[in-house]
Amino acid sequence: QRFAQAQQQLPLESLGWDVAELQLNHTGPQQDPRLYWQGGPALGRSFLHGPELDKGQLRIHRDGIYMVHIQVTLAICSSTTASRHHPTTLAVGICSPASRSISLLRLSFHQGCTIASQRLTPLARGDTLCTNLTGTLLPSRNTDETFFGVQWVRP
Amino acid sequence: QRFAQAQQQLPLESLGWDVAELQLNHTGPQQDPRLYWQGGPALGRSFLHGPELDKGQLRIHRDGIYMVHIQVTLAICSSTTASRHHPTTLAVGICSPASRSISLLRLSFHQGCTIASQRLTPLARGDTLCTNLTGTLLPSRNTDETFFGVQWVRP
Amino acid sequence: QRFAQAQQQLPLESLGWDVAELQLNHTGPQQDPRLYWQGGPALGRSFLHGPELDKGQLRIHRDGIYMVHIQVTLAICSSTTASRHHPTTLAVGICSPASRSISLLRLSFHQGCTIASQRLTPLARGDTLCTNLTGTLLPSRNTDETFFGVQWVRP
């Protein structure tokens, strides 16, 4: 019985199914395009199991291949608004350490008000992911409209 | 040899990699915004391993963090017709038990004809997920255009 | 200690967490709507662990349920361009063996310049996945804008 229980725990502890789902906290000051995230059961349905937040940015704690996903909805938006303020672009990337800085995922809104995508990417312990929203439109803070998460997939 | 076999089964049975991918069965009567789903190998490439269908809605059988994903394409659509009924919105949420009712994922079509997104969320045994399509435009029943699924990720 | 290490390897070797993330190599000649993919650490952040490339198309090596995901961004694109060249459509499907040929995922660009989606689907060893982009617009080769991947989820 104890053996079976130990087995159940292995994937979480040894293999480290690190996972996080974050909700938008706030946008940065005008010259800072980064979105600032928050997570934790007290906030609703967001959580961090493994990764951590560092000043609103997500820091990876375990090497591996991760599924990174994001959805961002613009707050006050119609297809007309979205195209008037073109280009509004979202980019997810590794922003630190600087030596590993790279854009992982990039989408423009064009005439839409929501972008959503996902991708597999190798990440290393200490990598910090930043999500940059360029343009003059603000993202919705509704937790079912704007969210960002990672899921450890394999070493 | 027997030990290795037992190991292979553990994640499926003990850890319970519950997973489901559903295809659209039908829409509800006019006052019911819910989409009704179906799944099973006889229907094509849809399946349920763990979760169940309850009157076309997906019911969760195992507590855990799940990746929920959905794509819905409007049946007859151009960028002009997509905005014929504004707003046409898709929302995925827990609709029962009522005490846990919440919107998990929400997207509007604006001038687009397809929405697709995914997110990580904690779900509990007995949670029923509903997908509400508000508006007067019909979703395509083509299995490569409209689908809805969940994947258990970790406890 | 050796026991714990053996455990850690089991999911990768016995359960076979096959995974691949590919970047666009090139498009086909005019009459060939297929996108040709490439992957490997030398190319950047793309990789193949299990699946293989066969003339730029992804071939599956292990039976199971997979999460298939894709993002394609059109290279020179505005909402006007996208709608002028309508319909530009992306379809992901099993293209060989011919007996298993089927469309798994289909999206049109309409007035957008990026499509992104994902779905769960059963795949068998030997299945080759093709991604067909119909229309006259070219996909971006930027690795953060256009990518295609699969992740083994369960047997």
Epitope: S78, S79 | A75, I76, S83, R84, H85, L137, N142 | -
Partner: antibody, heavy 118, light 111 residues
């Protein structure tokens, strides 16, 4: 309850312009498109096109491109059909009809009779 | 454009009997799991009234004696049993693609 009330009958001379109104009540005007349908005396129904009440974008059937214009006064929940350079063959009853998306045209105005005669 | 041909152009049916009206499309109006065909009733001096949407669905408030069927290019409106108040002209209309078109109409007379 939902109602579409159209303006009264019009008698015009060839070459003149007419503007018909269709005032909607009982629902959110900008949530549903508005169709326009022509019916010549003793004849069948002809779909003229529709206007997107949210964006204001009109779509015209080929036979109604040029002299016909759909417009809106969103604040008054009103759609308009204007016909320029009237011809005898424009003599008809014109209906506005709410576009209930893929479910057809579910509410219709009572119709506006336009007579073009010299 | 999709041409809708209705038949017959007119018919007379005895009270309590069945009236059957046919509508044929020049190309399929079915796609993505639906048939985009609708039926309307128009009485003299009145606007049309939606009876059936998406080939077979009864609009709210419409009596159950009206029914629709068909897919692809061939559609049928049935009225059974016919009542006095059903004397009217009936039109089919598709919304498969722009431009939407109507059939030429079928005038139903009650004997």
């Amino acid at each position: 309850q939902i109602q579409l009330v159209q303006s009264g009958p019009e008698v015009k001379k060839p070459g003149e312009t007419v503007k018909i109104s269709c005032k909607a009540s009982g629902y959110t005007f900008t949530n549903y498109g508005m169709n326009w349908v022509k019916q010549a005396p003793g004849k069948g129904l002809k779909w003229m096109g529709w206007i997107n009440t949210y964006t204001g974008e009109p779509t015209y059937a080929d036979a109604f491109k040029g002299r016909f214009a759909f417009s809106l006064e969103t604040s008054a929940s009103t759609a308009y059909l204007q016909i320029n350079n009237l011809k005898n063959e424009d003599t008809a009853t014109y209906f506005c009809a709410r576009d209930y998306g893929d479910y057809g045209m579910d509410y219709w105005g009572q119709g506006t009779s336009v007579t073009v005669s010299s | 454009d999709i041409v809708l041909t209705q038949s017959p152009a007119s018919l007379a049916v005895s009270l309590g009997q069945r009236a059957t009206i046919s509508c044929r499309a020049s190309k399929s109006v079915s796609t993505s799991g639906y048939s985009f065909m609708h039926w309307y009733q128009q009485k003299p001096g009145q606007p049309p009234k939606l009876l059936i949407y998406l080939a077979s669905n009864l609009e709210s408030g419409v009596p159950a004696r009206f029914s629709g069927s068909g897919s692809g290019t061939d559609f049928t409106l049935n009225i059974h049993p016919v009542e006095e108040e059903d004397a009217a002209t009936y039109y089919c209309q598709h919304s498969r693609e722009v431009p939407w078109t109507f059939g030429g109409g079928t005038k139903l007379e009650i004997k």
